[in-house]
Interface confidence: low
Amino acid sequence: QPDAINAPVTCCYNFTNRKISVQRLASYRRITSSKCPKEAVIFKTIVAKEICADPKQKWVQDSMDHLDKQTQTPKT
């Protein structure tokens, strides 16, 4: 779970150990604030749960890529 230390800065202190199926993911946001101890990705699941993940891991990168492709509408 992400922690809001001093709103509006949200940080992750631990990452999930489990790979989450992309079908369960609704969106993500990157955490890059220098106020946080580590860079992170926070996934929001389809049931609105927020999960901290390591952006250096392949499954995280691939999940972000999948979500990006869902939201990018091709130009006509």
Epitope: K56, Q57, K58, Q61, D65, Q72
Partner: antibody
């Protein structure tokens, strides 16, 4: 901290092959992608390809397809790039890099490959 | 393949100057852009990713902006250690491609 240490400089004859190694420390290579980028003297950067060390799935720039082989040994945390049918235009510094989502946050020190008859 | 055009190819500036480097993609890269700094004989160093996100440890005088096909790297107040070559790189799709580089020299 993350460190990528590459093998030493090589001088090769045209038509031969070269194999460059990249040993990683401070990270689990099976959790990330390892990429290879080259830079000819006085020129810009050119992405060659990458490997997923976990399943050995590779992706290449089509211009290198068939001539480059990228492998990885997770037991030694080492990635390898082999380039065959060398020509003078392949004279360059070859870098390995840890890929994060398609960009590169840690780089090896580079390996100079000179192709000369 | 997505082509990246960087300009200018070189520029002369003084310490304290504001420097702007631009990068144009041949198609929308959806902010999938990174900037690197390279000094002679050294490997490139990641400065910015995702068009605007500063890599940890990179001074705040570096900033990135842009969207769609057009992106900019700005150095707000050039320091002696900033004289180097800068490259943009798209990571929208493989093959990942770099701009031709911008050499920042001392005036």
């Amino acid at each position: 901290q993350v460190q990528l240490v590459q093998s030493g400089a090589e001088v090769k004859k045209p038509g031969s092959s070269v194999k460059v190694s990249c040993k990683a420390s401070g990270l689990t290579i099976s959790h990330t992608y390892m990429h290879w980028v080259r830079q000819a003297p006085g020129q810009g950067l050119e992405w060659m390809g990458r490997i997923d060390p976990d399943n050995h799935n590779t992706k290449f720039d089509p211009k290198f397809q068939g001539r480059v082989t990228i492998t990885a040994d997770t037991s030694t945390s080492t990635a390898y790039m082999e380039l065959s049918s060398l020509r003078s235009e392949d004279t360059a510094v070859y870098y390995c890099a840890r890929g994060v989502f398609g960009f590169f946050d840690h780089w090896g020190q580079g390996t100079t490959v000179t192709v000369s008859s | 393949d997505i082509q990246m055009t960087q300009s200018p190819s070189s520029l002369s500036a003084s310490v304290g100057d504001r420097v702007t480097i631009t990068c144009k993609a041949t198609e929308d890269i959806y902010n999938r852009l990174a900037w690197y700094q390279q000094k002679p004989g050294k490997a490139p160093k990641l400065l910015i990713h995702g068009a605007t996100s500063l890599e940890h440890g990179v001074p705040s005088r570096f900033s990135g902006s842009g969207s769609g096909t057009d992106y900019t790297l700005t150095i707000s107040s050039l320091q002696p250690e900033d004289f180097a070559t800068y490259y943009c790189q798209q990571f929208r799709s493989a093959p990942y491609t770099f701009g031709g580089g911008t050499k920042v020299e001392i005036k």
